[in-house]
């Protein structure tokens, strides 16, 4: 079996303030089992945007039904975008762990740019 890759096909996305941003991410394998998380930024200071396993993320919805059998689409939509949302977003696959899941592989990132609303 080929090792899982995390594909973020869009290097950059431009969204108008107030609109919804779609950040695309797919995995190439069902193995290993484990959740996806989305972060803005990289390194220890990165900001968690969405965690499939747990948490409440009112601005975020998933594009696909995560409970759909054999789902490998982990794209998200972020609503009501503001200039503060600009940055690079990473889709990160975690491997089921005991007691905690372990980061397995990250996508290359998608840079979100926000176009100001015309006044």
């Amino acid at each position: 079996e080929e090792e899982l890759q995390v594909i973020q096909p869009d290097k950059s996305v431009l969204v108008a303030a107030g609109e919804t941003a779609t950040l695309r991410c797919t995995a190439t394998s069902l193995i290993p089992v484990g959740p996806i998380q989305w972060f803005r930024g990289a390194g220890p200071g990165r900001e968690l945007i969405y965690n499939q396993k747990e948490g409440h993320f009112p601005r975020v919805t998933t594009v696909s039904d995560l409970t759909k059998r054999n789902n490998m689409d982990f794209s998200i939509r972020i609503g009501n975008i503001t200039p503060a949302d600009a940055g690079t977003y990473y889709c990160v696959k975690f491997r089921k762990g005991s007691p905690d899941d372990v980061e397995f592989k990250s996508g290359a990132g998608t840079e979100l740019s926000v176009r100001a609303k015309p006044s």
Epitope: E1, L30, I31, V33, G34, Q52, K53, E54, G55, D65, L66, T67, K68, R69, N70, N71, K96
Partner: antibody, heavy 119, light 110 residues
Framework: QVQLVQSGAEVKKPGASVKVSCKAS????????INWVRQAPGQGLEWIAM????????HYNQIFKDRATLTTDTSTSTAYMELRSLRSDDTAVYYC????????????WGRGTLVTVSS | DIVLTQSPDSLAVSLGERATINCRAS??????????IFWYQQKPGQPPKLLIY???NLDSGVPDRFSGSGSGTDFTLTISSLQAEDVAVYYC????????FGQGTKLEIK
């Protein structure tokens, strides 16, 4: 840490119904299937049914389709399995189990609920 | 429905020796390049524990003396060097269709 806490042991008369609960914690309840499996004393595992808490989609083992009903309460992250028209051969330990990979498998299990059917 | 048949029903193996349990499906459990077979271990008074998923992938925290192999209709769970704590009943499960379990194999120490 994923936990599935089941309700306590039950003793029922033939013809009665039983409703077993399974309270989930440590993860987003609506993102993962819940399975129900039973095990009669000294016997093997028998799959009953599964439910997707996000939309209440269910799949049943044909053997139980007419007697079992799965439900969930997303406000309390609790799954329920009701079995009607109980017979002595329904005496078993009933387990709930969570499917962490949408593979129709059982990654995390409750401790089980013993249901005894006796006149 | 897919029927899973395990063999043998019971098995006695010496400590440190290899234990092999087989699971045969009544039709193929393969789809889209994956084999939808899972292996569980159950010790007395405990719920089952997932060992292997998609035929050959070790679940988190499972010792690497356990391994799974096979494709199509024939699958094997192998314990390379039996330890005392491996005494249990082992079940295969398929999910190519809706889940079904094999009848179980009881593993004891010789």
């Amino acid at each position: 840490q994923v936990q599935l806490v089941q309700s306590g042991a039950e003793v029922k008369k033939p013809g009665a119904s039983v409703k077993v609960s399974c309270k989930a914690s440590g993860y987003t309840f609506t993102n993962y299937w819940i399975n129900w499996v039973r095990q009669a004393p000294g016997q093997g595992l028998e799959w009953i049914a599964m439910i997707d808490p996000s939309d209440s989609e269910t799949h049943y083992n044909q053997i139980f389709k007419d007697r079992a009903t799965l439900t969930t309460d997303t406000s309390t992250s609790t799954a329920y399995m009701e079995l009607r028209s109980l017979r002595s051969d329904d005496t078993a330990v009933y387990y709930c189990a969570m499917d962490y990979g949408s593979l129709y498998a059982m990654d995390y299990w409750g401790r089980g609920t013993l249901v005894t059917v006796s006149s | 429905d897919i029927v899973l048949t395990q063999s043998p029903d019971s098995l006695a193996v010496s400590l440190g020796e290899r234990a092999t349990i087989n699971c045969r499906a009544s039709k193929s459990v393969s789809s889209s390049g994956y084999n939808y077979i899972f292996w569980y271990q159950q010790k007395p008074g405990q719920p089952p524990k997932l060992l292997i998923y998609l035929a050959s992938n070790l679940d988190s925290g499972v010792p690497d003396r356990f391994s799974g192999s096979g494709s199509g209709t024939d699958f094997t769970l192998t314990i390379s060097s039996l330890q005392a704590e491996d005494v249990a009943v082992y079940y295969c499960q398929e999910s190519r269709e809706l889940p079904t379990f094999g009848q179980g194999t009881k593993l004891e120490i010789k």
